[in-house]
Interface confidence: low
Amino acid sequence: SGVFQLQLQEFINERGVLASGRPCEPGCRTFFRVCLKHFQAVVSPGPCTFGTVSTPVLGTNSFAVRDDSSGGGRNPLQLPFNFTWPGTFSLIIEAWHAPGDDLRPEALPPDALISKIAIQGSLAVGQNWLLDEQTSTLTRLRYSYRVICSDNYYGDNCSRLCKKRNDHFGHYVCQPDGNLSCLPGWTGEYCQQPICLSGCHEQNGYCSKPAECLCRPGWQGRLCNECIPHNGCRHGTCSTPWQCTCDEGWGGLFCDQDLNYCTHHSPCKNGATCSNSGQRSYTCTCRPGYTGVDCELELSECDSNPCRNGGSCKDQEDGYHCLCPPGYYGLHCEHSTLSCADSPCFNGGSCRERNQGANYACECPPNFTGSNCEKKVDRCTSNPCANGGQCLNRGPSRMCRCRPGFTGTYCELHVSDCARNPCAHGGTCHDLENGLMCTCPAGFSGRRCEVRTSIDACASSPCFNRATCYTDLSTDTFVCNCPYGFVGSRCEFPVGLPPSFPW
C-alpha cells in the first residue's frame, strides 16, 4: 500500500489557446486530470488501473502552482494504491479549459482539451522527487513525482506491513525496511518477550514486563536464585526447592532435632566435660569437687567419704584429713592393726582372716558397705541414670525415673514412636521430640496417612495464556494444552502467533 504523488509546479500557455489552436474566451481557465495505470509501452486508451485524480481550476493561461491546497485542491496530488508497487507505471496528464463551473468529464466538450502528455517508465519507492518538463508546440508543463509507502507499509515495493505498537501483541517501532525495532526492555521476533531484570535466573525466574523478576514456585530472592527450603525447616538449608539439609549438629525432617546439645547449649558447669548422648541428651563428667546432672553443685572433699573404717573426715584448705579410729592408720585409715579376733565387722558382717591373720576382710550383708560394713548403701551416689533420669532409693534397691522419650532400667533407651509403624499406606514415619510425624505418599493425607485423596494437579491453575489443563490421574501430574501461539510445559512462552504481519 502506498501513494503516487504528483506535484504540479508551472504551466505555460502564453497564447491562451486550446489544443485545437482556438483561443479560450476570455482566457484558458485551466484544470488538470491525471490518470495513473500499469506500464504500457505505448500508452493506450483504457481504464486508469492505478487510479485517477482531478484538480479544481488552478489558474488562467500561464501560472505557477503553490505547494498546498489551491481552491480546494491538493498539491501534491495523491494517487493511493493498495497493492505491491510494481516499480513501473504509465502516467497521463491532461490540461483542460473550464468554460463554466461543472468540471465533470461528461459536462465538458471534447475540444476543451488544452494539452495531453503521457509518460511511462520505472520508478522506485523513495522520498526523492523526480523533476520532469514536457513541452508541446504551444504549452509547457513542469512537474515532479514520487512513490512513497502509506503509513505502516515499508520495503522496496511497500509490501511489508509494520504498525508500531506497544500492547499485548508487541512492543516495537518500525525500521525503514519494515523490520521491527523492539522498544527498550523487549525482545523476540515480535518484541513480545520482556527482558527480565538483569541477572534474573533463566529457569527459576520469569517476567511479564521489562526489568521484572518473578520467581517460579520454590525460588525466592531479587534474582530468583535462592531456593525456598521445606516449610518449617529450622536449622537447615537447600540447594533445590523444598529441601531441608541440616546444619552441623541438627537432625530430623525439619532439622529441629538437636544432635549437638553440648555445643548449642553448653549445659555443663564448672569446667565439666560434656558428651552428646543422643537427641537433646548429654552427660556431664564433673571435675573433682563438683556434682549434679550439670556439675552445678560444689562438693566438700569430705562429701565423697574418703575415710575408711569409720575414720572421721576433716576439711582442710588444701584437701582433707582422716582421723582414724583405734586399730587403723593410713591416709584414708585403710590399713588395719586389727584382726578377726577384735570383731571388726559391723552390721552382721562376716570376718575373713588374710595374710596369716595379719589382716582381715569383712563380707557385708546387703545394704551395707565399707571395709568394716559400717556404711549403709546409697545406691544413687554413682548417678546411674542416663539422659537426665532421676535416681530414687527404694530400700534395698534403686530405681530410675526417666524423662519423656527415654526408657530402660537406666533410661538408656530412646523411645521410638515409630516402632509400631503408625503411618498407613506406605507413609514415612519421623520421630519428633514430642511425638511423631507421617509424610504421606501422593494420594493420601491425614495425621496417619489414613485419608485417601484424589489429587487435582490442575487446582492451582498452573497453565498460562488461557491454556486448558488436564490432570493425569495415573501420575497425579498436569498437562497443559496450549492455545495457538504458545508453547512450554505451562504454555508460558509465546511463539509470536497469531502473527501481526504478512511476511
Epitope: L161, K163, D167, H168, S208, C458, A459, S460, S461, F464, R466, A467, T468, C469, P483, Y484, P498, P499, S500, F501, P502
Partner: antibody, heavy 124, light 112 residues
C-alpha cells in the same frame, strides 16, 4: 458506534445447510483489534459459543468442538460482513443465533455489542 | 471445558430490594496477572444479551452503579443494590479464560 445486523432464513430443512449473515457498521471486519463471535441459544443448551473469526494479516478461526466439522465462517471485506455456514443441520440446531464483537484490548476481550439474533428452526 | 454453575435459577425480587446472584466455576478463572476472566450479561425479554460487567467487577459503559461484581478464583457474585423495573430479565455469567467460552445456565430475576 459499532452495530451488528443479522439476516438469514428462519426455517431450514434437516440435512440442508444453514447460512446466516452479520453486517458490521462502525468498524471494519478486517480490523486487527476485533474478533467476530457466533453464539447460539436454545432451551436445551442455553447459551452456546460456536466460534470466532479474526484478521491478523490473514484470517484465523476458532471453532467449538461440537460443530467443528460442520461450521465455516466467511468474512467479506467488500461488504464488511461475516457469514456463518452450518452444514447438514438437524433439529438439534434449532436455536437463536447471535453474532457478537469481541474487542481485543491489551488484557481482555469481551462480547459487546451483540446482533439482534436470528431465530432458526430446523424442521421438515 | 470449564463449567459455570449459577444459583439460584430463579430469583423473585420486590423493586427497591437488593438481589444477589452466585456463579461458581469448575476451575479457577484467576491468571497470574491478577485478573479473573469472568463477565456478566443481562438478557431482557425478547432482546439479545448485553454486557453488564467484565473482569469480575468492571462495569461496562452506561451500566448504573447499583450493579457490582465481586469474587476470585472459582466463586463470583453479582449484586444489585436496589432492583429497578428495567433490571428484570435473565443474568448470565461467562468465562473468557479459554476457548470455548462457556456460559452459566442463567438466573431469572422476576417481580415478586
Amino acid at each position: 458506534q459499532v452495530q451488528l445486523v443479522q439476516s438469514g432464513p428462519g426455517l431450514v430443512k434437516p440435512s440442508q445447510n444453514l447460512s446466516l449473515t452479520c453486517a458490521i457498521s462502525g468498524d471494519s471486519v478486517s480490523s486487527d483489534s476485533a474478533a467476530w463471535n457466533w453464539i447460539r441459544q436454545s432451551p436445551s443448551r442455553g447459551l452456546e459459543w460456536l466460534g470466532r473469526t479474526y484478521y491478523r494479516s490473514k484470517w484465523y478461526n476458532d471453532y467449538a468442538v461440537s460443530v467443528k466439522s460442520r461450521i465455516t465462517f466467511n468474512p467479506d471485506t467488500s461488504k464488511n460482513h461475516i457469514s456463518l455456514q452450518l452444514n447438514s443441520v438437524t433439529p438439534e440446531d434449532t436455536a437463536i443465533y447471535y453474532c457478537a464483537r469481541e474487542g481485543d484490548n491489551w488484557n481482555y476481550g469481551w462480547l459487546d455489542p451483540w446482533g439482534q439474533g436470528t431465530t432458526v428452526t430446523v424442521s421438515s | 471445558d470449564i463449567q459455570l454453575t449459577q444459583s439460584p435459577l430463579s430469583l423473585p425480587v420486590t423493586p427497591g430490594e437488593p438481589a444477589s446472584i452466585s456463579c461458581r466455576s469448575s476451575q479457577s478463572l484467576l491468571l497470574s496477572n491478577g485478573y479473573n476472566y469472568l463477565d456478566w450479561y443481562l438478557q431482557k425479554p425478547g432482546q439479545s444479551p448485553q454486557l453488564l460487567i467484565y473482569l469480575v467487577s468492571s462495569r461496562a459503559s452506561g451500566v448504573p452503579d447499583r450493579f457490582s461484581g465481586s469474587g476470585s478464583g472459582t466463586d463470583f457474585t453479582l449484586k444489585i443494590s436496589r432492583v429497578e423495573a428495567e433490571d428484570f430479565g435473565i443474568y448470565y455469567c461467562m468465562q473468557a479464560l479459554q476457548t470455548p467460552y462457556t456460559f452459566g445456565r442463567g438466573t431469572k430475576v422476576e417481580i415478586k
